[in-house]
Amino acid sequence: APISSHCRLDKSNFQQPYITNRTFMLAKEASLADNNTDVRLIGEKLFHGVSMSERCYLMKQVLNFTLEEVLFPQSDRFQPYMQEVVPFLARLSNRLSTCHIEGDDLHIQRNVQKLKDTVKKLGESGEIKAIGELDLLFMSLRNACI
């Protein structure tokens, strides 16, 4: 089971009008550049076999991957939104740094790995897609971690 006290984010993180608006604007800009509408990275399948109490830990993994493998490499794109949103998401990641689960997390890693593989397979268009789904990442983090 997760060490649940550490796998939490305060609701206030998701109620800041300015940065919330910028996050969704960034997602919108990127989704306009996404021509692969048949693939969904963040959706029901990501959570298959994952209990409600483990979902924040799963989303922490997705957030960290998105930051390290998508947003940092694409940091020169989609300005001015990117320069404001990346530090915001990095702060959320930092607040979840002590979020771990005790025992086997293989089922979670398997689901996250499928997302990673899809992004890598699609190359740059996979990275654009991941940025276009930041609204879904935001909502999934909000629902799983507050």
């Epitope: 969704f24 919108k28 959706g43 029901e44 935001f138």
Partner: antibody, heavy 119, light 107 residues
């Protein structure tokens, strides 16, 4: 071509039960959340219930909680709405609609089936 | 539940007019707002999703805007086919809720 066809509507007396069905075709049914939305005669739209693609998660409007059960059979590409303890205010056209996930709109709707609760 | 308040409830307009319908949420729903068009005896049709994205097959004269609690649907130049009832819907959280509808009539 995406198609959603509702059936099972009809006249039922107050307190009675009815089971609505929705036959889906033209898309991978198990990939989609499915919903029931109703519309009383001359009134607006009211969301009733939704179910996840796997069937593992279900959601209900407060107005129907405890009286209605949503279910699906992915092998048969079918969605169901079991209604019991029906009231006159449940009289409406019931639409079946699909949306990819929680944060997706209802992009395709069936033509609806009329449920009339009257003595 | 999140309440959706649509205005006006009825709107009379002429062919070629620019028309705006508004929708207000009782609490913030980010951009999780859809607009539907419904004609008598027919099922609703999706026009706009994520507040401002045009649905597949929807005419480009329809546009949406807004974020948080206040949203608008605009028809840039009214066509004969546009006389119908329009509904907004929030899908930020269950229970999903619809506005009361706006009936667009010929003046």
């Amino acid at each position: 071509e995406v198609q959603l066809v509702e059936s099972g509507g009809g006249l039922v007396t107050p307190g009675g039960s009815l089971r609505l069905s929705c036959a889906a075709s033209g898309f991978t049914f198990s990939d989609y959340y499915m919903s029931w939305v109703r519309q009383a005669p001359g009134r607006g739209l009211e969301w009733v219930s939704a179910i996840s693609g796997s069937g593992g998660s279900t959601y209900y409007a407060d107005s129907v909680k405890g009286r209605i059960t949503i279910s699906r059979d992915n092998a048969k590409n079918s969605l169901y709405l079991q209604m019991s303890s029906l009231r006159s205010e449940d009289t409406a056209v019931y639409y079946c609609a699909r949306g990819l996930w929680v944060w997706d709109p209802l992009d395709y709707w069936g033509r609806g089936t009329l449920v009339t609760v009257s003595s | 539940d999140i309440q959706m308040t649509q205005s006006p409830s009825t709107l009379s307009a002429s062919i070629g007019d620019r028309v705006t319908i508004t929708c207000r949420a009782s609490e913030g729903i980010y951009h999780w707002l859809a607009w539907y068009q419904q004609k008598p005896g027919k099922a609703p049709k999706l026009l706009i999703y994520k507040a401002s994205s045009l649905a597949s097959g929807a005419p480009s004269r329809f546009s949406g805007s807004g974020f948080g609690t206040d949203f608008t649907l605009t028809i840039s130049s009214l066509q004969p086919d546009d006389f119908a009832t329009y509904y907004c819907q929030q899908y930020s959280e269950f229970a999903w809720t619809f506005g009361g509808g706006t009936k667009l009539e010929i003046k």
